[in-house]
């Protein structure tokens, strides 16, 4: 697994540089978990055709991942802060449980998918110091949760293997927009 | 697996308060989600509030600005500060804890009894 941000050997040769903001540090971690999706991703690929398959709309009925829309706030068109880091957080909290699906769904990246989970974790926190309103924050419902996932996991093979690329593809596509708009805070 | 244990209930006058414990004792206290729920007489058990692993807190509609959930991770508790208490709030109360985010409330307590008289 990747080192985490802050941890490899240039912060450790240059402790004269400035400690990160706020803003950076969130920046770094984004693109760590984007490097362990990455690898995830290569993984998932390797062992089945289905980044190149045309089924995945079938699949993608049945998951209801979080995605950016126009009312989120964190387009250009429309920007507003407080909306949208509402809808990261929210989006982020959501994807906690197809992260727990993960965990069981790789051989020679298991560490990985958990660096990324917990990496996950650690975005959260530093993303709730910057909000405002954590009170227009819905976090999901352990039993609707519990019920997903086990839905998740009686499915066949095929369905499973399509359901870990698309909660990848997906969970890659909602950072890259957090990462956009976080950068225009 | 985590034991929990609810204290704090009692008989209380409407609009009065009372503070709801729940201890946790077991395996490392860090659970995904902790739950407040309650079950009124001759009723079905009903949501009443969760605070998630960061501390973000969500309430039912019936308990909103008069209920708060907070945490002390250090002697591994969970409250339930209740005000302006009504008749309707009357219920055994219980906390649940879910371990992992998929896992569901897979830890109960066994309740503790709030009446509120008018």
């Known amino acids: 697994a990747p080192v985490p941000p802050g941890e490899d050997s240039k912060d450790v040769a240059a402790p004269h540089r400035q400690p990160l903001t706020s803003s950076e540090r969130i920046d770094k971690q984004i693109r760590y978990i984007l490097d362990g999706i990455s690898a995830l991703r290569k993984e998932t690929c390797n062992k089945s055709n289905m980044c190149e398959s045309s089924k995945e709309a079938l699949a993608e009925n049945n998951l209801n991942l979080p995605k950016m829309a126009e009312k989120d706030g964190c387009f250009q068109s429309g920007f507003n802060e407080e909306t949208c880091l509402v809808k990261i957080i929210t989006g982020l909290l959501e994807f906690e449980v197809y992260l727990e699906y993960l965990q069981n769904r790789f051989e020679s990246s298991e560490e990985q998918a958990r660096a990324v989970q917990m990496s996950t974790k650690v975005l959260i926190q530093f993303l709730q110091k910057k909000a405002k309103n954590l009170d227009a924050i819905t976090t999901p419902d352990p039993t609707t949760n519990a019920s997903l996932l086990t839905k998740l996991q009686a499915q066949n093979q095929w369905l499973q293997d399509m359901t870990t690329h698309l909660i990848l593809r997906s969970f890659k596509e909602f950072l890259q927009s957090s990462l956009r708009a976080l950068r225009q805070m | 697996q985590v034991q929990l244990v609810e204290s704090g209930g009692g008989l209380v006058q409407a609009g009065g308060s009372l503070r709801l414990s729940c201890a946790a004792s077991?395996?490392?206290?860090?659970?995904?989600?902790m739950g407040w729920f309650r079950q009124p007489p001759g009723k079905v058990r009903e949501f009443v509030g969760r605070i998630n692993w960061s501390g973000i807190r969500n309430y039912a509609d019936s308990v909103k600005g008069r209920f708060t959930i907070s945490r002390d991770n250090n002697n591994n508790t969970v409250y339930l500060q209740m005000n302006r208490l009504k008749p309707e709030d009357t219920a055994v109360y219980y906390c649940a804890a879910a371990s992992r985010s998929g896992s569901g409330y897979d830890s109960w307590g066994q309740g503790t009894q709030v009446t509120v008289s008018s």
């Open positions: 077991g395996r490392t206290f860090s659970p995904y989600t």
